[in-house]
Interface confidence: medium
Amino acid sequence: EPHSLRYNLTVLSWDGSVQSGFLTEVHLDGQPFLRCDRQKCRAKPQGQWAEDVLGNKTWDRETRDLTGNGKDLRMTLAHIKDQKEGLHSLQEIRVCEIHEDNSTRSSQHFYYDGELFLSQNLETKEWTMPQSSRAQTLAMNVRNFLKEDAMKTKTHYHAMHADCLQELRRYLKSGVVLRRTVPPMVNVTRSEASEGNITVTCRASGFYPWNITLSWRQDGVSLSHDTQQWGDVLPDGNGTYQTWVATRICQGEEQRFTCYMEHSGNHSTHPVPSGKVLVLQSHWQ
């Protein structure tokens, strides 16, 4: 997994009039990291992990940068032609990555009302757009504006590749965001579902990186996909992730079922608690 920094900026218009607020979210290595969500942007670290990365400092620099980016994206939205009545959004997602071999990637993507219409490889400066004619019309709008108004938007559209990588390297140097493996804590719980049946849920939390295999097995054999229900792998606010898988089984057959977990080359199995024992915790190292 490469290290990554991802900026997600969203601005809104109502009946063709661009709204003054904007929303900015920054993700570091896939984790919510900073957020600006007010008219007057204050960069807010998302959880203790983000504060640890940023260190004991104010976030004036991040606030200034994110505010500038928001203003520039608002200007871009103002130049999108033929905005229909009602509420519309322009979103810019900017991503930079540093791979283990120290190679880098940077890209920028524009979405209007949630639909991708323009992307740029920030290293090669190559623009791409979907084939749909609506996307191409929007792309023409934005590219024309960026060309004509390059000076007005210099904070936003110049040296983005370098700036993003510089910030990412700065965050990585904090020592908190190092290539690391954090094993999951696994909990198995049961709850009464209906007469003769119980629902068993296997939860994995506190793990990093996010790739994990979690599934139910009966007599050592994986259950079919359609008999299991999975939760999304979600950040837990501490720089780690959580997820779950559940299935329904017949009461009295608990001993035949185990939760199988695989993460970063390690694996373990976890039985269903029987009787009145509701939770079994096991944390492998």
């Epitope: 063709g16 130049h79 032609k81 229909k84 609506r134 019309t137 004509e148």
Partner: antibody
Amino acid sequence: QITLKESGPGILKPSQTLSLTCSFSGFSLSTSGMGVGWIRQPSGKGLEWLAHIWWDDDKYYNPSLKSQLTISKDTSRNQVFLRITSVDTADTATYYCARRTQGYFDYWGQGTTLTVSS
Amino acid sequence: DIVMTQSPATLSVTPGDRVSLSCRASQSISDYLHWYQQKSHESPRLLIKYASQSISGIPSRFSGSGSGSDFTLSINSVEPEDVGVYYCQNGHSFPWTFGGGTKLEIK
């Protein structure tokens, strides 16, 4: 009250340049989101969009005619102009200017007729 | 370019009839479809915006429907003053294109 009015030469010879003016009132082309375009209609036929200019001076042209067309504006005088070079008999039509704000042409001028004849 | 096809080319109706005019786009344009009415020796007038949204000052007997690539303009009870040519317009994608028109006549 919003009005638009087109004016032009009326008659031209083939290969000459057509210059059209759209004079409007009741709105300003300096307003964000505002645009004015040109549409033409040969007698007894359908409508063909030609060109459009926006408040920020961004210009759109019909690709099939782009090499012949130039659209411009004078915001302070509330006027939009269209030039078509090298006209021929196929350019004989009524030329309309129309206001466009949120995706549709909501106000149209009365039209000006051009005849191209040698 | 998106090609807009209108049918029928001509429609002869009796006052009081309910009529439907069809417009088809060569690819999906969501609801970015606008209808215009043009009476003889007059300039076009906006009737319906975004497939079904009414326009202030337009009689309520005019309504629009459809989404994607198939659209319909309906006139609830035709009146003699409704004669003219009706055009649909692609407002979705550049270049903006119009249909060939449907001519409405009174028998």
